[in-house]
């Protein structure tokens, strides 16, 4: 097989015919050294998935349910290109499965038992698989056959295409359960009509169904959405209140050696030449031989799926939960309203050791999961492999953009017993230099810089945001002669100063000696000219407070702060000499786990928090000998957020604006994936 050939998998004679036409037309418009198409015919989409996994084909386009099959071992395929619908300016690659109710009704998602339900059709995504998958563990046992369990859960339903003889309750609202538009309650519009007519109490449809059926906002305002957290929202808040986000139609490839760049190059060229309204002789998104061949006829084009986005992230936690429940039919033994152990995400093996000790002391209420970077941890929380972790504000922003929510804040200044209920203002982000140097904020160009990590508040977002507004470009590695900013490209000058050791050089975790607040300060002590840290870093690592060899003889008076007005001040005066106020670190979790995480952590800190005085013979949650493992070592307590329970409210408008501006310079693959 030539290196630049993409073997497309076709699942019918008609698809194979279109594939050959696709191949021939691409040959006529692409240079001989460009990508080419080859066609492989298989009997089904599942056979195509297996063929790609076995390297007998390279690509196929799949519906969401099949993307799930493709992702499962041993297939291990990943999404590489998404079809989009709507306009190029506002491309839609996903739809949202929602539960619609009338505003004047008064029940929540956890009170659906005994209500009347309207569905688009048996086995369909938004109308059946997702809602029934998510409700699966609430269905009465035995849960097989599924239709019987659903019939016994609701007091009456309309499920088009169901067997009305065996399951009459499923056809109670639409006698016969007709499987076509002859049934007035069939499909999306039909299920909505079933609700509108008052036949049912809830309709399981797509987010767009309401807008397509009710052009008038006043009419739409008579309806609401049921959210998974047992609240309701208006119908236009579907992005924050849905059962699952469902990808429409996706090209998949192998996770390793999958030719994703070649596939994108091919499809990008194909949409340029043969996309909507581009060519008379061959159309990518239609065919005389049949409907939806190779690609959906309704598609308007393709978008490249960000490389960080694997199938779990693409399909989303809710969708995977729903499909897994339906397929595997397994439910936790514990009742769903009881808190299961919380899986904490630990960064690399140093945090993992502390987490393990916590787990032993918590009597198993805490479990541990590891990842090599903060972004990998956030991804694990998103997909349910982990539940929670404490993050710097810069990562609270990324986690928030990825759908996680802040749960508790680390407090550093408020003594107990008021600590738990106090909202602190934050800490100061400062620039530290040696007293012996002549540096000021205005002559940092060409100097050696030390950063906690890329994407963190005091070490990156605040100083680089201020720098960006001064230099108007993102080439920070050219502004400083060299530096250590863990998480930078390995060949960047901002990795040159890092200490490693080798395979971990410049990695954004504790294996890199210059990572974090203490690491950035160490970088200044040993190699750098300026360190961007929190205001407490110098006092915490001088005067013998840090016993490590590099720090034990350091004196606080040998360091000063740079002020934005060009002056310098003592490290004792951060309130009058700082770059900005930074939001405290905060614990984040998935929305569905937030309450359990909060309850458990408040309980854990009562046992292992700052009230424990002897950490040499007791486990201390907020202690790791200046290394800030799992939590900052100067944490006094974890505090309730009260109404600051979204990332925007928690971080504050000013900080969110600053980080959003800095996104022009973003090197965050996760953020790119979460905003796809």
């Amino acid at each position: 097989v030539p290196e630049k050939s993409v073997r497309w998998c076709a699942v019918s004679e008609h698809e194979a015919t279109k594939c050959q036409s696709f191949r021939d037309h691409m040959k006529s418009v692409l240079p001989s050294n460009g990508p080419s198409v080859a066609c492989v015919k298989k009997a089904s989409h599942l056979d195509c998935i297996r063929a790609i996994a076995a390297n007998e084909a390279d690509a196929v386009t799949l519906d969401a349910g099949l993307v799930y099959d493709a992702y499962l071992a041993p297939n291990n395929l990943k999404p590489v290109v998404a079809e989009f619908y709507g306009s190029k300016e506002d491309p839609q690659t996903f739809y949202y499965a929602v539960a619609v109710v009338k505003k004047d009704s008064d029940f929540q998602m956890n009170q659906l038992r005994g209500r009347k339900s309207c569905h688009t059709g048996l086995g369909r995504s938004a109308g059946w698989n997702i809602p029934i998958g998510l409700l699966y563990c609430d269905l009465p046992e035995p849960r097989k056959p599924l239709e019987k369990a659903v019939a016994n859960f609701f007091s009456g339903s309309c499920v088009p295409c169901a067997d009305g003889t065996d399951f009459p309750q499923l056809c109670q609202l639409c006698p016969g359960c007709g499987c076509s538009t002859l049934n007035q309650y069939f499909s999306y519009s039909g299920a909505f009509k079933c609700l509108k007519d008052g036949a049912g109490d809830v309709a399981f449809v797509k987010h767009s169904t309401i807008f397509e059926n009710l052009a008038n906002k006043a009419d739409r305002d008579q309806y609401e959405l049921l959210c998974l957290d047992n609240t309701r929202k208006s119908v236009d808040e579907y992005k924050d209140c849905h059962l699952a986000r469902v990808p429409s139609h996706t090209v998949v490839a192998r996770s390793v050696g999958g030719k994703e760049d070649l596939i994108w190059e091919l499809l990008n060229q194909a949409q340029e030449h043969f996309g909507k309204d581009k060519s008379k002789e061959f159309q990518l998104f239609s065919s005389p031989h049949g409907k939806d061949l190779l690609f959906k006829d309704s598609a308007h084009g393709f978008l490249k799926v960000p490389p960080r986005m694997d199938a779990k992230m693409y399909l989303g936690y809710e969708y995977i939960t729903a499909i897994r429940n339906l397929r595997e039919g397994t439910c936790p033994e514990a009742p769903t309203d009881e808190c299961k152990p919380v899986k904490w995400c630990a960064l690399s093996h140093h945090e993992r050791l502390k987490c393990d000790e916590w787990s032993v002391n918590s009597a198993g209420k805490i479990e541990c999961e590891s990842a090599e970077t903060t972004e990998d941890c956030i991804a694990k929380i998103m997909n349910g492999e982990a539940d929670a972790m404490s993050l710097d504000g810069g990562f609270v922003y990324i986690a928030g953009m990825c759908g996680l929510v802040p749960v508790l804040a680390e407090n550093y200044n408020t003594p107990n017993p008021n600590c738990e209920n106090t909202a602190e203002e934050g800490y100061f982000a400062v620039a530290v230099v040696k007293s012996s140097s002549d540096l000021t904020w205005d002559n940092l160009k060409g100097k050696k810089s030390c950063h906690t990590a890329v994407g963190r508040t005091a070490g990156w977002n605040i100083p680089m945001g201020l720098l960006y507004s001064k230099i108007n470009h993102c080439r920070f590695d050219e502004f400083f002669s060299e530096g250590c900013a863990p998480g930078s490209e390995k060949n960047s000058s901002l990795c040159k100063l890092c200490m490693g050791p080798s395979p971990n050089l410049c990695e954004p975790n504790n294996k890199e000696g210059y990572y974090g607040y203490t690491g950035a300060f160490r970088c200044l002590v040993e190699k750098g000219d300026v360190a961007f840290v929190k205001h407490q870093t110098v006092p915490q690592n001088t005067g013998g407070k840090n016993p490590d060899a590099w720090a034990k003889n350091l004196k606080e008076e040998d360091y000063e702060l740079l002020c934005l007005d060009g002056s310098r001040k003592s490290v004792q005066e951060p309130a009058n000499c700082h770059l900005a106020r930074a939001p405290n670190h905060a614990v984040v979790a998935r929305k569905d786990k937030a309450d359990c995480v909060q309850t458990l952590l408040l309980d854990q800190q009562r046992m292992f928090g700052s009230s424990v005085t002897d950490c040499s013979s007791n486990f201390c949650l907020f202690e790791s000998k200046t290394k800030d493992l799992l939590f900052r070592d100067d944490t006094v307590c974890l505090a309730k957020l009260h109404d600051r329970n979204t990332y925007e409210k928690y971080l504050g408008e000013e900080y969110v604006k600053a980080v959003t501006n800095l996104r022009k310079c973003s090197t965050s693959p996760l953020l790119e994936a979460c905003t796809f």
Partner: nanobody, 117 residues
Framework: QVQLVESGGGLVQPGGSLRLSCAAS????????MAWYRQAPGQQRELVAG???????KYADSVKGRFTISRDNAKNTLYLQMNSLKPEDTAVYYC???????????WGQGTQVTVSS
């Protein structure tokens, strides 16, 4: 800080048993948490079992019901009783008391356990 020395490993058939010991050079009475870890070739080191001063224990899912951790403060020794051994239990086993902080790599020699027929 006490020094810890592991012993008791060896070659055993699937289904067999071993008892690992970890002898401390000083008193372990005031040590809060002690634990056994293991590392198989090419794998990360993982927690097998842990025990607190008060006797609270935690086990990895893969060993629950087969392994038992205990400590004898009078003998300054930590134990791991391993029953119904499986080939996947093959690894070097280490004990720790977490007392050196989490940052330094402070593992001892460990003791090799090989489960094979």
């Amino acid at each position: 800080q006490v020094q810890l020395v592991e012993s008791g490993g060896g070659l055993v058939q699937p289904g067999g048993s071993l008892r690992l010991s970890c002898a401390a050079s000083g008193s372990i009475a005031s040590i809060n948490t002690m634990a056994w870890y293991r590392q198989a070739p090419g794998q990360q080191r993982e927690l097998v079992a842990g025990i607190t001063r008060g006797g609270s224990t935690k086990y990895a899912d893969s060993v629950k019901g087969r392994f038992t951790i205990s400590r004898d403060n009078a003998k300054n020794t930590l134990y791991l009783q391993m029953n119904s051994l499986k080939p996947e239990d093959t690894a070097v086993y280490y004990c720790t008391d977490y007392s050196r902080g989490y940052y330094q790599d402070y593992w001892g020699q460990g003791t090799q356990v090989t489960v094979s027929s």
